[in-house]
């Protein structure tokens, strides 16, 4: 169930897809990873407060113990709730080869 | 991909499976379920630090480039990978029924 | 930013020769690294090239003659046994896939005896 | 061993002419544009003018332009400059790392 989509705390501070520019340094990849020379990373990033959307019942227990016991529960957090592909190029021992990745950029967020 | 199990942290700090107590008042449920009367909740707490249980690709992404802009990009977040499934008896408008949920209890945790 | 290469000499065949690149205003570290070379009045031949960690992959001409090694401030190129026909031109320069964009001016390596 | 032909040399161009080089290869480069263009000049190092087959390095003038993918690609160089005199040689990364290489080279002549 994906529950509200409208922030208590303000436009864009809860949870949704933001565009970080990175280099294959940055990422770690310069070594292994030909192209692109540089990724447009899609992640899920902002707060998630009460029933914001809710990715399913265990989220909906957590908002609730968090409300409860905040030191010991954390709040849900915002992760991918689905993926985009991505080919990258990349070195083998002998050359080169495209793979495709299913699980590297976040196309939708929720909170869990 | 299922990366490092030891945790730098010490024991038990970093992203696990944990069991929190809670009675159906705490969960806001005591006016639909009638059982169980309290339930043992199992939740993922914990800190993520680099590369523990990195559930994908996306999150060694996300570990490097919190590395890099630690205000502008999260850790990763200890969340479910897979659920338990529990059984509620639950009040109906006629009756009581008995409803299986997939995805209230966690299983198993990783860092995403 | 730019890159040069040791001084090339006059060797005997079978001598080991080890060339030398030193970079100057950018990190080894973080780019791929070429070896080229070129005979007298002949066109280029790519030796081989390096990665930001230093693993090496050559060409197949190449066929174990060369060594490409790599520290945090040089890349070296080894001619591992010389013979007259590796009398050229040796350039190192920066890059692999999006083309070698800084090279230094070259270092003739004579090999006769 | 992979095949890199160039335009044979040499090639005559006149001072604001247009000159074309081509350069085919008898596989395809990776991604299909995995293909650069150098400038040599006697007694100096190639220079870099195009890689990813089209795209223009830093500082090198418009007039020149390349095209081409996957194993057809051409270097043409418009209002052709008495500077431009020098030997022009394509290179390509193929999936195979014991295929890269150069084309044999181009020289051209300005008159």
């Known amino acids: 169930a994906r529950n509200g989509d409208h922030c208590p705390l303000g436009p864009g501070r809860c949870c949704r897809l933001h565009t970080v520019r990175a280099s294959l340094e940055d990422l770690g990849w310069a070594d292994w990873v030909l192209s692109p020379r540089e990724v447009q990373v899609t992640m899920c990033i902002g707060a998630c407060p009460s029933q914001f959307r809710a990715a399913n019942m265990h989220a909906q227990i957590k908002t609730s113990l968090h409300r409860l016991k905040p030191d010991t529960v954390p709040a849900p957090c915002c992760v991918p709730a689905s993926y985009n592909p991505m080919v990258l190029i990349q070195k083998t021992d002998t050359g080169v080869s495209l793979q495709t990745y299913d699980d590297l950029l976040a196309k939708d967020c929720h909170c869990i | 991909a299922r990366n490092g199990d030891h945790c730098p942290l010490g024991p038990g700090r970093c992203c696990r499976l944990h069991t929190v107590r809670a009675s159906l008042e705490d969960l806001g449920w005591a006016d639909w379920v009638l059982s169980p009367r309290e339930v043992q909740v199992t939740m993922c707490i914990g800190a993520c630090p680099s590369q523990f249980r990195a559930a994908n690709m996306h999150a060694q992404i996300k570990t490097s480039l919190h590395r890099l802009k630690p205000d502008t990009v999260p850790a990763p977040c200890c969340v479910p990978a897979s659920y338990n499934p529990m059984v509620l008896i639950q009040k109906t408008d006629t009756g009581v029924s008995l409803q299986t949920y997939d995805d209230l209890l966690a299983k198993d945790c990783h860092c995403i | 930013q730019s890159v040069k290469e040791s001084e090339g000499r006059l060797v005997t065949p079978g001598t080991p020769l080890t060339l030398t690149c030193t970079a100057s205003g950018f990190s080894l570290s973080s780019h791929w690294m070429s070896w080229v070379r070129q005979a007298p009045g002949k066109g280029l031949e790519w030796i081989g090239f390096?990665?930001?960690?230093?693993r090496a992959y050559y060409t197949s001409w190449v066929n174990g003659r060369f060594t490409i090694s790599k520290t945090s401030t040089t890349v070296d190129l080894k001619i591992t046994s010389p013979t007259t026909e590796d009398t050229a031109t040796y350039f190192c320069?920066?890059?692999?896939?999006?083309?070698?964009?800084?090279w230094g001016p070259g270092t003739l390596v004579t090999v006769s005896s | 061993a992979i095949d890199m032909t160039q335009t044979p040399s040499p090639v005559s161009a006149t001072v604001g002419g247009t000159v074309t080089i081509s350069c085919q290869s008898s596989?395809?480069?990776?991604?299909?544009?995995?293909l650069a263009w150098y400038q040599q000049k006697p007694g100096q190092p190639p220079k870099l003018l195009i890689y990813d087959a089209a795209t223009l390095a830093s500082g090198v003038p418009s007039r020149f332009k390349g095209s081409g993918s996957g194993t057809q690609f051409t270097l043409t160089i418009s209002d052709v400059q008495c500077a431009d005199a020098a030997t022009y040689y394509c290179a390509g990364v193929y999936n195979n790392d014991s295929d890269n290489g150069f084309g044999g080279g181009t020289e051209v002549v300005v008159k």
């Open positions: 320069a920066r890059g692999y896939t999006s083309g070698l964009d800084i």
């Open positions: 596989k395809s480069v990776v991604n299909g544009d995995w």
């Open positions: 390096v990665s930001p960690s230093g």
